[in-house]
């Protein structure tokens, strides 16, 4: 019962997490104009992975997609890739885990197969969560680097008569959604892995069989000779699962221009 609950909860948590990763990837507020210590502009800028937007104080919002692939910073491309990989792995993991759920009966699927699938989906969720967390963290690092570069620029080269509004960007809502969603997917994956251990049948003891020798009335239970003979129900249904090695690319921030309102 506890195993079913753990598996079910792991599935639900991962589902919420993956939905969050998808939402974060689609959101436009990955970086938003920093309003602190700046003049009150009548324009507010914010950017996502796929387009940048400008919201005027009049209420009008205009968004423009990044219609170039080669012209985009490598780090932005890396973040996009990490998020997409996270979504794809998460989606496959969800599909696998649906069939692995103990409460769902599919033909004559054995518990060992369900255990296998549960572990597979769990690993997929873990990697998916890590991809999302990595993607969001790379973007955040990029923002921090650019923020301080912009701040440095604000206090240099001000010798001229004409002032310019230096637009700086700070963390947008999508980053927090991404971190939380990645964390949830990761937790869900761990729960699935834990559930997998409980799903694998530990031992299948055969029922005792009585053998009657002529003239004697002694019942032999094969299980009793386990230690010495190796017969009986000593063989356990255990598998060694290889989670597979996972490597993550090292990432570094790229400087990006940002706007403010």
């Amino acid at each position: 019962m506890a195993v079913t609950a753990c598996q079910g909860l792991g599935f639900v948590v991962s589902l919420i997490g993956i939905a969050g990763i998808i939402a974060a990837t689609c959101m436009d507020q990955w970086s938003t104009q920093d309003l602190y210590n700046n003049p009150v502009t009548a324009v507010f800028n914010y950017q996502g992975l796929w387009r940048s937007c400008v919201r005027e104080s009049s209420g009008f919002t205009e968004c423009r997609g990044y219609f170039t692939l080669l012209g985009l910073p490598a780090m932005l491309q890396a973040v996009r890739a990490l998020m997409i990989v996270g979504i794809v792995l998460g989606a496959i993991g969800l599909l696998v885990s649906i069939f692995a759920l103990k409460c769902i009966r599919i033909g004559s699927m054995e518990d060992s197969a369900k255990a296998n699938m549960t572990l597979t989906s769990g690993i997929m969720f873990i990697v998916s969560g890590l991809c999302a967390i990595a993607g969001v963290s790379v973007f955040a690092n990029m923002l921090v680097t650019n923020f301080w570069m912009s701040t440095a620029n604000m206090y240099t080269g001000m010798g001229g008569m004409v002032q310019t509004v230096q637009t700086r960007y700070t963390f947008g809502a999508a980053l927090f959604v991404g971190w939380v969603a990645g964390g949830l997917t990761l937790i869900g994956g761990v729960m699935m892995c834990i559930a997998c251990r409980g799903l694998a049948p530990e031992e299948t003891n055969y029922k005792a069989v009585s053998y009657h020798a002529s003239g004697h009335s002694v019942a032999y239970k094969p299980g009793g000779f386990k230690a010495s003979t190796g017969f009986g129900s000593n063989t356990k249904n255990k598998k060694i699962y290889d989670g597979g090695a996972r490597t993550e690319d090292e990432v570094q921030s790229y400087p990006s221009k940002h706007d403010y309102v």
């Epitope: 502009t41 009548a42 800028n45 940048s52 937007c53 009049s58 002032q163 940002h258």
Partner: antibody, heavy 118, light 113 residues
Amino acid sequence: EVQLQQSGPELEKPGASVKISCKASGYSFTGYKMNWVKQSNGKSLEWIGNIDPYYGGTTYNQKFKGKATLTVDKSSSTAYMQLKSLTSEDSAVYYCARYGKGNTMDYWGQGTSVTVSS
Amino acid sequence: DIVMTQSPSSLTVTAGEKVTMSCKSSQSLLNSGNQKNYLTWYQQRPGQPPKLLIYWASTRESGVPVRFTGSGSGTDFTLTISSVQAEDLAVYYCQNAYIYPLTFGTGTKLELK
């Protein structure tokens, strides 16, 4: 057709208050912010502030804070501006103007003349 | 506050003539987010409220004759009337639409000889 109909001219004594109105028609009143602009005799234009009819949120020019109060009545699609503690400096033509794309004032009322005299 | 400086303060022209007026802002009005300059031009005929002519420094409002052209970027802007007509006699104001408080220029008065 978008129209902004302002109330008639006002003659007030110093220290008094005046409330001028701007009735909007021909568009969704709550969909656009309303700006108020002051034009003193033959002089340039001064932005007073704006109000969002949907939320009632306001943004003021610091110079007019405490002098002007912006309100709206959604049911009648009317924006109001109240001017307090009037002085001769407040004698001017006041315009309401719809806030449009590009942070522009795309439609203007005909203006309300306020004269402060003892 | 952003100071908008217009020059000349008045212009006397003949019908059909090309006219250029300038507007300078004390801060850049260019928004890097969409690469648009938040500068607006208005026309105010005598006894009338101002009328929107050009926004984003160079985008003509619908219904505005093509003889009106806006140009410039950052802090320096220009309004050009390619062939002045009698109905163009008015005061022209430029406006900062980028940073609060929204501010207007002192105006350029266009008069006919």
